[in-house]
Amino acid sequence: QRFAQAQQQLPLESLGWDVAELQLNHTGPQQDPRLYWQGGPALGRSFLHGPELDKGQLRIHRDGIYMVHIQVTLAICSSTTASRHHPTTLAVGICSPASRSISLLRLSFHQGCTIASQRLTPLARGDTLCTNLTGTLLPSRNTDETFFGVQWVRP
């Protein structure tokens, strides 16, 4: 019981429970396929406890195994729009440091306007996650349609 009380008084970060849930801020300029994210209580249901945003990209502050999840909905889209603009692809990966650059998730919009996925993956302090949307379709900024997050699971 004393442990439970102590837990409640400690911030999540100090327990290693790093977690972030982000909403889309904007897309990049024309030759930049990255999505730029934002988070914080002032924005509603988004937050950062541990990880931080660096120019709209999520940077990890604690080593560990994380659950990474993402959903992206295309904004001006109906059943066949995505197929008429094929290929539209979403990729999540470690984009810096360059020595750790790797793709973690790759998804294609084929017949639908929404894609969602998650996976467990080891991440290290200093890893920056980038989400690249390639193709000509734009993502929705509605917070229930497009979101991105990570959750520390274990060391």
């Epitope: 904004a75 001006i76 109906s78 066949t80 729009t81 509605n142």
Partner: antibody
């Protein structure tokens, strides 16, 4: 058959507002992306705005951003364009157009003329 | 924004002749280009989509070709009802943009 009928055009002074409507029939309106496209007298076509099938996502041409608002009422099968702070350069025939599901336009209304003049 | 340049501005031809209209994009639009026909006092009509596909009900004398930045609309043998203004339109990037138009007039 597919029909799009615009209304609401007319003569208006600079700085004033106008709301255009487009009544749709002959297809399942709520399933389609819709656009407004305009054409100044004797000039070419200019895309103005687009709205998603559910009305939750919209994009605008830079020339009208912050002044025009596209909306739709799927229960009434009607598309709208609210035009505020009108300028002389907004004078044009305004067409509503149905999207092909790929950002080109397979059906157009007959157009409604908006004249902005003092 | 992507700029579409159409040429020539005016094409003077006789019925039965072949018409070749050009549309050039300021950057690649892949094959995401459409062509429209507009007659005086009427709304535009979709002729060709995705550079080379004829829209429903469009006669076979209309054909489109090209990809990347250079596109062509060909009318193999002009009928009297084909004299009109023709516009190209790209759907690769927002804002969607149209070319300035080519007027096909009777010589």
């Amino acid at each position: 058959q597919v029909q799009l009928v615009e209304s609401g055009g007319g003569v208006v002074q600079p700085g004033r507002s106008l709301r255009l409507s487009c009544a749709a029939s002959g297809f399942t309106f709520s399933s389609y992306i819709m656009h407004w496209v305009r054409q100044a007298p004797g000039k070419g076509l200019e895309w103005v705005a687009v709205i998603s099938y559910d009305g939750r996502n919209k994009y605008y041409a830079d020339s009208v951003k912050g002044r025009f608002t596209i909306s739709r009422d799927n229960s009434k099968n009607t598309l709208y364009l609210q035009m505020n702070s009108l300028r002389a350069e907004d004078t044009a025939v305004y067409y509503c157009a149905r999207d092909t599901d790929g950002y080109d336009f397979d059906y157009w209304g007959q157009g409604t003329l908006v004249t902005v003049s003092s | 924004e992507i700029v579409l340049t159409q040429s020539p501005a005016t094409l003077s031809l006789s019925p039965g002749e072949r018409a070749t209209l050009s549309c050039r994009a300021s950057q690649s639009v892949s094959s995401y280009l459409a062509w429209y026909q507009q007659k005086p006092g009427q709304a535009p009509r979709l002729l060709i989509y995705d550079a080379s596909n004829r829209a429903t009900g469009i006669p076979a004398r209309f054909s489109g070709s090209g990809s990347g930045t250079d596109f062509t609309l060909t009318i193999s043998s002009l009928e009297p009802e084909d004299f009109a203004v023709y516009y190209c339109q790209q759907r690769t990037n927002w804002p969607l943009t149209f070319g300035g138009g080519t007027k096909v007039e009777i010589k």
